[in-house]
């Protein structure tokens, strides 16, 4: 696993413990909370990052209308169960034996139940809509410049293959980034759109997961882009199953 050899740190995940105890004295990094070995040449899975976060001490419009099945992460933080590959287990339960099913980004997609609740498979989130509102600037951003900058960001910083950034929409002051990645499209070694979206969200919140970096401050052709608010919508390959009571 690639880690900075000189001082043995993980460039892509500051929530790790690293030591030169890998094969041949190579630097090896393990995620806090789970103790799982992580690959520091790419993004760490959201499940392992959430687990690490919970273990750490407290410190005609061009815009897309989210589908009726789009999920927003309203439940917030929880200590997830991750599988051996670092993915979310389809069923998550808390200490009081309340259980629910989640999608591949760890967002609840069913009503809460008890230990008898079954979650047959981990349903993939194949479409993520990141909705940003920016603060007033010297003028509207040029759409193509903004598009290029955000695509560059996801390619270079988050190592997400450009084909998974489906579109960048802009209607001042709202920016929308659409990420799409079907199960069939995701090859071995490809960064998951859910992981890229989570790193981006943490960057915008000034809680960068990258080693030695603060938050992410974007600029487009020199113009500072100050984000006012962020909303992320998740669309699953199979629509979520909530009772009518929740929908009303």
């Amino acid at each position: 696993h690639t880690a900075a050899q000189d001082n043995c740190t993980c460039p892509t995940n500051k929530m790790t413990v690293c030591s030169p105890d890998g094969p041949g004295g190579r630097c090896q990094c393990r995620a806090l909370g789970s103790g799982m070995a992580v690959d520091c040449s790419t993004l760490t899975s959201k499940c392992l990052l959430l687990k690490a976060r919970m273990s750490a001490p407290k410190n005609a419009r061009t815009l897309v209308r989210p589908s009726e099945h789009a999920l927003v992460d309203n439940d917030g933080l929880y200590d997830p169960d991750c599988d051996p590959e670092g993915r979310f287990k389809a069923r998550q339960c808390n200490q009081t034996s309340v259980c629910w099913c989640v999608n591949s980004v760890g967002v609840r997609r069913t009503d809460k139940g008890d230990l008898s609740l079954r979650c047959d498979e981990l349903v993939r989130t194949h479409h993520i809509l990141i909705d940003l509102r920016h603060r007033p600037t010297a003028g509207a951003f040029n759409h193509s410049d903004l598009d290029a900058e955000l695509r560059r960001l996801f390619r270079e910083r988050y190592r997400l293959h450009p084909k998974f950034v489906a579109a960048v929409h802009y209607e001042q002051p709202t920016i929308q980034i659409e990420l799409r990645q079907n199960t069939s499209q995701k090859a071995a070694g490809d960064v998951d759109i859910g992981d890229a979206a989570y790193y981006f969200e943490r960057d915008i919140k000034g809680e960068s997961l990258f080693q030695g970096r603060g938050g992410l401050d974007l600029r487009v052709r020199g113009e500072p882009l100050q984000v006012e608010r962020t909303l992320i919508y998740y669309l699953d390959e199979i629509p979520p199953k909530f009772s009518m009571k929740r929908l009303t």
Epitope: R135, G206, Q226
Partner: antibody
Framework: QVQLVQSGAEVKKPGASVKMSCKAS????????IHWVRQAPGQRLEWIGY????????KYNEKFKGRATLTSDKSASTAYMELSSLRSEDTAVYYC????????????WGQGTLVTVSS | DIQMTQSPSSLSASVGDRVTITCKAS??????LAWYQQKPGKAPKLLIS???SLETGVPSRFSGSGSGKDYTLTISSLQPEDFATYYC????????FGQGTKVEIK
């Protein structure tokens, strides 16, 4: 290395205008905005506004809207600030500054231009 | 506008002392906080950005911490060249500075 060199001190009468310059070198001028910040004697630093040399777009602190005018000359890699209707409270050191390469903090500063407003 | 309140406004300390300066924002600034050092007659010098990231060439005795609305600059062992005025600045919503903390020799 990055350098911002500002014009010399000015003494002005109340009601007059002052125009000062900030010459940038050591980087591509159009890559970053130029901020203007002032500091009155014994006071905190106060952000006036910025200009984007790319397109001459400007953003101002509400307090200075209508009185401060920011311009730039790409060919000379120079930014300018003009402040009109001067009053004694405008006596201050005026700084230009360039943002940090990765954040919106201000990493490189000019040496400052002292403006004294006195009758 | 976001207001930045620094405390104390001044402090007296000796070489070798540990010095702590705090900065409180009127709302959450999501770690978009910088600390500057300013000496008389000079322009401010950026020490820390992103609340915790030390700028290149800044001695490791300087450190930044905090989140949300509350941030701290710590000088672990004050050196003679550290006597100056320190300012915090938020850059989450435009740019505003704290009123400064003057660190004087006791």
């Amino acid at each position: 290395q990055v350098q911002l060199v500002q014009s010399g001190a000015e003494v002005k009468k109340p009601g007059a205008s002052v125009k000062m310059s900030c010459k940038a070198s050591g980087y591509t001028f159009t890559t970053y905005v130029i901020h203007w910040v002032r500091q009155a004697p014994g006071q905190r630093l106060e952000w006036i506004g910025y200009i984007n040399p790319n397109n001459d777009g400007t953003k101002y602190n509400e307090k200075f809207k209508g009185r401060a005018t920011l311009t730039s000359d790409k060919s000379a890699s120079t930014a300018y600030m003009e402040l009109s209707s001067l009053r004694s409270e405008d006596t201050a050191v005026y700084y230009c500054a360039r943002p940090h390469f990765e954040t919106h903090a201000m990493d490189y500063w000019g040496q400052g231009t002292l403006v004294t407003v006195s009758s | 506008d976001i207001q930045m309140t620094q405390s104390p406004s001044s402090l007296s300390a000796s070489v070798g002392d540990r010095v702590t300066i705090t900065c409180k924002a009127s709302e959450d600034i999501f770690n978009r906080l910088a600390w500057y050092q300013q000496k008389p007659g000079k322009a401010p010098k950026l020490l820390i950005s992103g609340a915790t990231s030390l700028e290149t060439g800044v001695p490791s005795r300087f450190s930044g911490s905090g989140s949300g609305k509350d941030y701290t600059l710590t000088i672990s062992s004050l050196q003679p060249e550290d006597f100056a005025t320190y300012y915090c600045q938020q850059y989450w919503n435009t740019w505003t500075f704290g009123q400064g903390t003057k660190v004087e020799i006791k």
